[in-house]
């Protein structure tokens, strides 16, 4: 007995389609082990005609994918656009060679079976409406209309000429003539169920003259499209229901054991499993809505449905459409922190995966909004200038070509508490939430600017330090200007080698940076920050004021600016300080400049991908050094 | 709620025949499984056979011992899942239930499925 399983017959009809879901034990091996599908001859051979390292034949180019489930110890082979000439016996199975362990299934593909030709069929989906056809002679014109359905015994009345109604159909069954035409009633039923199904006369007049027509009604229930996701991306549900439901509130909901439970509709109703990591975006007038769920979960797999009603939930008789949701623990989509904590004053450094094959792409970063049907305004993006809101405390960090992003936020403070979505504008599967946790500081910030008040003087020097606990010793130090397009990193170097001390003081380690002479253009933004490699750590904030010389005291008060300009993390950072001038860049408005939602995967902004580094110092001409201070005793 | 009921059970000699069926009714959808799966007593619930359909496509499993005797199909119009039960044997003998599923699970399995029927008796003598 094969420990492989599956169905033993698998039959569909040409055109269509067949998902072939094979069992294998839970063994490390198997889980790892070719997964195959193979034709048997006449000769016994069995021809591989796709396997899961990769080979597909010629003759399922286009149309088979072979999909392993190692959580669930299962694979599925797809095979659309059946033909007649797909009928025969396969297997399917595991190991290095077809003669593996495996378990044979046979596929039938039968023709699109002919109908009786006295019979008129019509298939129409559950939650639809049908107007049924029903021709008579002339001479039938004055006598009684009518429309029932077979029963075992009988044919039970549905509605009449004279206005008779079964009581299962008020409200949803209408007779009725077009214009002039006598040789022809309609009966239009809607809100179809299931139990609306099955055979039905038209009748016009009574005994042996009567014209009579035989209607077979096939009510459908949608067959669910299959959804194959990997764990952590995101998923699209496209729902179309037609112009008939476009004013209905819409509903995604998620089949149990009972009930449909809603997880989001566009009443305000949302599963808090969901929170923050889903949204509900009307298309058009055609009652077309998308929902949009990101960070996919292993329990998030199963049997999803949408639908209009005006309650917002599932109702019998109304149109819907559904899907099965597979998630794959086998994921491309690498394994980050969904919850990042801060503290007030403090900063964070998000780590943004993208797909490596999409450096190009433009990078965004949005706040999730749970208010109406969800919205993600955008505040920061490669071409997209930082929400005003945000001034002097955000910046994107793009790394060419290794899959990752930095978003750094810092002046934290509770209100920045919430979800955040990295997205970019090319592969939509690589959409990630994270949710950031603010607590109230409750201790003195890791990296320190002084003056704090930062004022500096037209045509003179000005030197700012940045002061670093010594967990940082190790750490690359930088300064960066800030502007709305990122913070251009300010090239540093060394001011001598570095000296090794036995003792760290923890009050002398400083990164400076100089402004000499202090142009206008100098005024704005500092950030001081550490970061290992490309990875991005702490950072502070501070403001500097140009103001021109004037007589008596050349300082004034501290702009409000620097008083949120600390920072505490358990992160670690870098050292350095500057001299000379920066080349002001011109800041190009980004693509979110008037539309700033990121509303919807397929709307996305698919403008050019020239990418704007807002992490380079391309251009700069400014210079900072290291300087390390060692006290002796 | 979908309910399912069983009918169709009874007693019959070895060798011969038995049609069982299952009917389901409350909730549908365009995708399900049914299976038939057998107690003894004294024994655990046994798989028989299951078939799950998606649009016009269907899919049909069976257990080794029953392969080639028992057939599963299923009645559109009447929403049920006949199961023919030929060359009955003495040891075929149990209560017959009938699982069904909107998910895709391994069908073997009970914990696969959601909704159960009360049962049919089959008793065969030799």
């Known amino acids: 007995k094969s420990p492989i399983f599956g169905p033993q017959e698998v039959s569909s009809i040409e055109g269509d389609s067949v998902s072939i879901t094979c069992y294998y034990p839970d063994t490390s091996v198997n889980r790892h082990t070719r997964k195959y599908w193979c034709r048997q001859g006449a000769s016994g051979m069995c021809t591989t005609l796709i396997s899961s390292n990769g080979y597909l034949s010629k003759e399922y180019s286009g149309r088979a994918n072979l999909i392993n489930f190692p959580e669930n110890n299962t694979f599925v082979i797809n095979i659309e656009q059946l033909t007649q000439d797909d009928t025969g016996s396969y297997k399917c199975g595991l190991g290095t060679s077809n003669r593996g362990l495996s378990f044979d299934v046979s596929l039938e593909v039968s023709q699109v079976p002919e109908l009786p030709s006295d019979t008129h069929v019509y298939t129409k989906d559950i939650g639809r409406n049908v107007t049924i056809e029903c021709p008579f002679k002339r001479e039938n014109a004055p006598s009684k209309k009518s429309l029932c359905k077979k029963t075992n015994q009988s044919c039970e009345l549905v509605i009449d000429s004279t206005e008779k109604v079964n009581p299962s159909y008020i409200g949803r069954a209408k007779l009725f003539m077009k214009g002039t035409d006598l040789t022809v009633f309609y009966v239009n039923i809607s809100h179809l169920t299931h139990n609306d199904a099955g055979l039905y006369i038209c009748q016009a007049g009574e005994g042996p003259s009567a014209d009579k027509k035989n209607v077979d009604l096939q009510v459908l229930a949608p067959e669910p499209e299959l959804l194959y996701k990997d764990l952590r991306s995101s998923v699209t549900f496209e729902c179309d229901l037609g112009r008939e439901v476009a004013n209905e509130a819409k509903y995604l909901c998620r089949m149990n054991k009972e009930t449909c439970d809603v997880i989001i509709n566009t009443l305000g109703k949302r599963d808090p499993d969901f929170e923050g990591r889903i949204l509900i975006t009307p298309k058009d007038d055609n009652g077309r809505f998308s929902v949009l769920i990101t960070g996919l979960r292993k329990e998030d797999a199963g049997h999803y449905q949408c639908g209009a009603h005006s309650s917002g939930l599932p109702q019998e008789g109304w149109p819907i459409q559904t899907w099965q949701l597979f998630v794959n623990e086998e994921s491309t989509i690498p394994n980050r922190r969904s919850v990042v904590k801060g503290v007030t004053g403090g900063s964070v450094a998000i780590a943004c995966p993208y797909n490596p094959k999409e450096s190009s792409s433009l990078k965004y970063w949005c706040r999730w909004e749970g208010d109406g049907n969800g919205h993600c305004p955008v505040l920061v993006g490669t071409q997209a200038q930082v929400q005003e809101e945000y001034e002097g405390r955000l910046a994107l960090f793009d790394q060419p070509g290794n899959g990752t992003y930095t978003v750094i936020l810092n002046q934290l403070t509770t209100e920045d508490a919430g979800f955040y979505w990295c997205l970019t504008n090319g592969d939509s599967r690589w959409r990630t939430t994270i949710e950031l946790q603010v607590a109230e500081a409750t201790r003195e910030p890791n990296l320190e600017v002084t003056p704090q008040n930062a004022t500096a003087v037209l045509g003179e020097t000005f030197t700012v330090s940045c002061h670093y606990p010594c967990k940082f010793y190790s750490q690359e130090k930088y300064w960066c200007k800030w502007s709305n397009k990122g913070c251009h990193i300010l090239p540093s170097h060394d001011e001598g080698a570095r000296q090794s001390s036995v003792s760290c003081d923890q009050s002398s380690q400083l990164v400076s940076m100089t402004l000499n002479p202090v142009s206008k253009e100098d005024e704005g933004w500092y950030w001081c920050g550490v970061k290992q490699g490309q990875t991005y750590g702490e950072t502070t904030a501070i403001y500097i004021a140009v103001e021109e010389r004037t007589r008596g005291s050349s300082h004034v008060n501290p702009t409000d600016a620097n008083a949120r300009a600390k920072v505490a993390l358990e992160e670690e950072v870098v050292d350095s300080s500057i001299s000379e001038k920066e080349n002001k860049a011109i800041p190009n408005p980004g693509p979110f400049a008037n539309e700033r939602e990121i509303q919807n995967v397929g709307d996305q902004a698919q403008e050019n991908r020239a990418s704007g580094d807002a992490g380079s110092a391309d251009g700069q001409s400014r210079s900072s050094s290291s300087k390390h201070h060692h006290h002796h005793h | 709620e979908v309910q399912l009921v069983e009918s169709g059970g009874g007693l019959v000699q070895a060798g011969g025949s038995l049609r069982l069926s299952c009917a389901a009714s409350g909730r549908t959808f365009g995708s399900y499984s049914m299976g038939w799966f057998r107690q003894a007593p004294g024994k655990e619930r046994e798989f028989v056979g299951a078939?799950?359909?998606?649009?016009?496509?269907?899919?049909?499993y069976y257990e080794d011992s029953v392969k080639g005797r028992f057939t599963i199909s299923r009645d559109n119009a009447k929403n049920t899942v006949p199961l023919q039960m030929n060359s009955l044997k003495p040891e075929d003998t149990g209560v017959y239930f009938c699982?069904?599923?909107?998910?895709?699970?391994?069908?073997?399995?009970?914990?696969?499925?959601?909704?159960w029927g009360q049962g049919t008796l089959v008793t065969v003598s030799s």
């Open positions: 699982g069904g599923t909107m998910e895709r699970r391994d069908p073997r399995r009970t914990s696969a499925y959601d909704y």
């Open positions: 078939i799950s359909w998606s649009g016009s496509s269907t899919y049909k």
